[in-house]
């Protein structure tokens, strides 16, 4: 039960006090007791319950005609059963007893009131009235946890506007209200109560820029809302009528969890005694609700796809046809960003990452806009954000970014268990350098901080700076699987490729050509690739880099070797000893459920079939996956990217609720 106030009683004159239902009020009977009295007894109206505890010994008795010693070890507490119909309608009489004097009486007139701030602390999607209870003030994780949840109102319900809904202090319509969390103030008081008392709703100054609270005012025509708390306003005096009354508030978060903001926001209602005009107002009671701002959550390849994004650029019609067909097979919506909007920037994966935010009453997809800001920079804000589609960005918006700040370098694993630790929403993966140096690249600290602060998908730093482009999607991917952990990790593997080529040469196919059918490209015989010592050295280095990540992923995701599939792939070291794919990088694939869009490798044709395609199919088809090989050679591969780099996917949110996990 929540702590109420301390009431001191005195025989000199009657004491008047307010007691809030659901609170435990301390009664000080000792400090003003007559000098020659040694004990006391208590009588109450039926609506008051008094508890007396005397320690030592710690005997606890209910009141009756018993008398209790007047000493500091006595604790008197009272609670009220119901709200008062009129001021002071409940009475407590303290009788002080002494050996030589008649009893001396002290009177306490109590007014019972109900004042409670309620929100969906049980996370059911409904607000249930809660009396002033201690545990509303704490937010706890897990299936038995409690505490309310706020969404950052980061969508744009007004198509005419260019700003997010949380950037203005207006409520557009009932649709906009659904992005907010309901909070209700319930009051039950005597009719004249608020002539002598006031309620103030407030938020800590340190949190005022993270939240906005609207008060719903029911008019005859429609419900209208006005801002009562927000970045410019940490407190608001409430005009509350006496009697029984409910006041609704709608709360929106303005900021995601981040380095200096753990995501918790406490809203408090304080009851002030304003009865004595010449004295300052005194706090009589406070009730609080703690909200946690819903984190931004990424979705792995194992989640069902809902929408595919791709760019239309000069001469990529065939690529578009292939992606369109794949999206149709996977029953996905397809969004094509036209040339005039992408400004010749085809790297859809690098510009944005689509995740979601969730509260018990609402789930909202949210696009995380990378700070790379090339030709596609306007696409997330102008074309993706909209009604019920949120937006967030981090990092420097002008300069100061590296290639590792693009979101081909941001992936997430499927759900995993590592030892005793469960990651029911998977773990974020991003690439970094091995160690900081004058020329090393890393993901911008603001991005790293944001990702870590979401708490629910604890990030893992991989090593990707060895690549020219430097993105994790150049050496890893995840595909759904019907067995084991429900997925497989795919890793690019030079070792596997050399093994395959060696087998082909041993079977007499050493003259088979890589890059057959590619115009203006030197075709390479299997035997020449196998005998090229420089290329072997390069791939030995690449293998070491990938193996480092392999061990890291096994450790951080709790994987066994049988959870990993090696995809044959060769790399070459280019300028400044950075690696890029020697032939189209098959691991850089588009995963749409069971349908995979894999870069066509143009491997050696043996018995009428590309041996690289055949090998990959033999590895993936037993998992129930369908492989489609997409020609991206001229439009993507030679520009240092592949199918995954050129596409993006919005996926179905997890059925698992983030608040049920324990980070």
């Amino acid at each position: 039960m929540a702590q109420g106030t301390l009431i001191r009683v005195t025989p000199e004159q009657p004491t008047h006090a307010v007691c809030v239902l659901g609170t435990l009020t301390q009664l000080d009977v000792c400090s003003s007791a007559p000098e020659d009295c040694t004990s006391f007894s208590v009588n109450t109206s039926p609506g008051v319950v008094v508890d007396i505890a005397h320690s030592p010994p710690a005997k606890k008795k209910s009141t009756g005609s018993s008398t209790w010693p007047l000493d500091p070890g006595v604790e008197v507490t009272l609670t009220m059963k119901a709200a008062s119909g009129s001021t002071g309608d409940q009475k407590v009489q303290i009788s002080y007893h002494g050996p030589k004097t008649p009893p001396v009486k002290a009177l306490l007139y109590l007014t019972g009131v109900e004042i409670s701030l309620s929100a969906d602390i049980t996370r059911t999607g409904k607000v249930k009235p809660t009396r002033a209870v201690e545990d509303k003030r704490t937010w706890t994780w897990g299936p038995c946890g409690q505490g309310a949840i706020l969404l950052v109102n980061c969508d744009r319900d007004n198509p005419e506007s260019s700003a997010m809904d949380c950037e203005d202090d207006e409520v557009l319509d009932s649709k906009d209200l659904k992005d907010m969390s309901l909070m209700t103030l319930s009051t039950k008081t005597p009719q004249d109560f608020f002539t002598r008392h006031t309620l103030v709703l407030h938020v800590a100054r340190s949190e005022m820029d993270k939240v906005r609270v609207f008060q719903a005012t029911r008019g005859r025509l429609s419900s209208r809302c006005r801002v009562v708390l927000g970045p410019k306003q940490p407190s608001h005096y409430l005009m509350v009528p006496g009697g029984k009354h409910n006041m609704d508030f709608y709360v929106e978060a303005l900021a995601f969890p981040d380095t200096n903001f753990p995501g918790l926001i406490t809203l408090t209602v304080s009851m002030l005694d304003t009865s004595k005009l010449e004295l300052p107002e005194a706090v009589v009671f406070q009730d609080s609700v703690v909200f946690r701002v819903a984190p931004w959550i990424m979705t792995p390849n194992t989640q069902p796809p809902q929408e595919v994004y791709v760019c239309s650029i000069f001469e990529n019609e065939d690529f578009l046809k292939s992606v369109t067909a794949l999206a149709m097979q996977a029953r996905c919506k397809l969004t094509i960003c036209p040339e005039e909007e992408n400004m010749d920037d085809q790297w859809m994966q690098d510009e944005m990452e689509i995740g979601y935010i969730q509260a018990p009453h609402k789930t909202l997809p949210v696009v995380f806009d990378s700070p790379r800001n090339r030709g596609l920079k306007e696409f997330p804000i102008k074309r993706v954000m909209g009604p019920d589609f949120g937006y967030v960005t981090r990092g420097p918006q002008t300069g100061g970014v590296s290639g590792l700040d693009s979101f081909g370098n941001l992936e997430v694993s499927p759900p995993v268990t590592v030892g005793d630790k469960e990651y029911p929403l998977g773990r974020i993966l991003f690439g970094d350098s091995c160690y900081p140096s004058s020329d090393s690249r890393e993901m911008h600290q603001a991005l790293q901080d944001f990702l870590s602060a979401q708490q629910v998908q604890a990030p893992v730093k991989l090593y990707s700076d060895w690549l020219t482009v430097g993105h994790v999607d150049e050496f890893l991917s995840f595909v759904p699987a019907p067995d084991r952990k429900g997925f497989r990790l795919l890793l690019a593997s030079p070792r596997s490729c050399y093994k395959l080529f060696q087998e082909q040469q041993n079977e007499g196919h050493g003259d088979a050509l890589l890059f057959q059918g590619i115009k203006k490209k030197n075709q390479q015989k299997i035997k020449n690739i196998l005998s090229n010592t420089t290329l072997r050295e390069h791939n030995s280095f690449v293998e070491r880099c990938i193996d480092w990540n392999r061990e890291l992923l096994k450790r951080e995701l709790g994987l066994a070797e049988s959870d990993i599939i090696d995809i044959p792939q060769l790399f070459k070291l280019k300028e400044f000893s950075k690696a890029e794919a020697f032939f189209p990088n098959m691991v850089n694939m588009l995963v749409l459920g069971k349908h995979l869009g894999i870069p066509k490798p143009f491997g050696p044709i043996i018995n009428g079939r590309c041996c690289l395609e055949e090998k990959v199919c033999s590895l993936l088809e037993p998992l129930g996956l369908h492989c489609t090989f997409i020609n991206d050679f001229y439009t993507y591969h030679i520009r240092h990217g592949e199918v995954h780099c050129g596409t993006n996917v919005r996926r179905k949110p997890f059925s698992f609720k983030w608040w049920n996990m324990v980070p």
Epitope: R374, S402, G403, S406, S437, S438, D439, R441, T468, V469, G470, K520, K521, N522, Q524, N532, T534, L535, H538, K572, L573, K574, E575, F576, S577, K578, F582, I638, R639, H640, G641
Partner: antibody
């Protein structure tokens, strides 16, 4: 073959800033590695900075790191060198140079380390 | 002071051969095959004449040749001609924090 033209040089006070541009014609600059090299009056060549074709990494000489920033805008077929906190010893002719990133090479061709096309240079004078 | 060491000047008569040396360390010239040579006439931009130690871009006469031994690279110009009079610079990739180094330059005088 690509042709390069530098611009943006001039007289600037110590501590000031300048932005040099390198505009390409005759070919798409996105297929080329680009470096900036400078030559102080009467002195030798000094390599300053590099940007790769994928626009994913940049390198700088120790003498300019933290003060100069190289960037490219493939849509404008240009590369830029933003020079801040300029010092008297930055006075030089600044050359933009490039090498084609030949995707056909089976192994590292070292094209980022040499410059086969040069502009005529733009003079930067840092003086009070 | 330049990172790669070249002689300040060399000279030769028309028709003769001259060799310009470029000495580095095991972290640049000695380690990589990315050594290049540039010719610069007064008031002009440099011109690439040798790359990857010994390769010649198209249009460069075969009188120009390159080689490397240990930490020293060399440029040899045979059959000297008057138009060869210029400054010559060597360059190498380096594993130091400045990844491309130049020599101080050698002034070639054709007598």
């Amino acid at each position: 073959q690509v042709q390069l033209v530098e611009s943006g040089g001039g007289l600037v006070k110590p501590g000031g800033s300048l932005r040099l541009s390198c505009a390409a014609s005759g070919s798409t600059l996105s297929d080329y590695f680009v470096s900036w090299i400078r030559q102080a009056p009467g002195k030798g060549l000094e390599w300053v900075s590099f940007i790769n074709t994928a626009n994913t990494f940049t390198y700088y000489a120790d003498s300019v790191r933290g003060r100069f920033t190289i960037s490219r805008d493939n849509a404008k077929n240009s590369v830029y060198l933003q020079m801040n906190s300029l010092r008297a010893e930055d006075t030089a002719v600044y050359y933009c140079s490039s090498a084609n990133d030949d995707v056909d090479d089976i192994v590292a061709p070292g094209r980022g380390y040499y410059m086969d096309v040069w502009g005529r240079g733009t003079l930067v004078t840092v003086s009070s | 002071q330049s990172a790669l060491t070249q002689p300040r000047s060399v000279s030769g008569s028309p028709g003769q051969s001259v060799t310009i040396s470029c000495t580095g360390t095991s972290g640049d010239v000695g380690r990589y095959s990315h050594v290049s040579w540039y010719q610069q006439h007064p008031g002009k931009a440099p011109k690439l004449i040798i790359y990857n130690v010994y390769e010649r871009p198209s249009g460069v006469p075969d009188r120009f040749s390159g080689s490397k031994s240990g930490n020293t690279a060399s440029l040899t110009i045979s059959g000297l001609q008057a138009e060869d009079e210029a400054d010559y610079y060597c360059s190498s990739h380096s594993r130091s924090s400045t990844p491309v180094l130049f020599g101080g330059g050698t002034k070639l005088t054709v007598l």
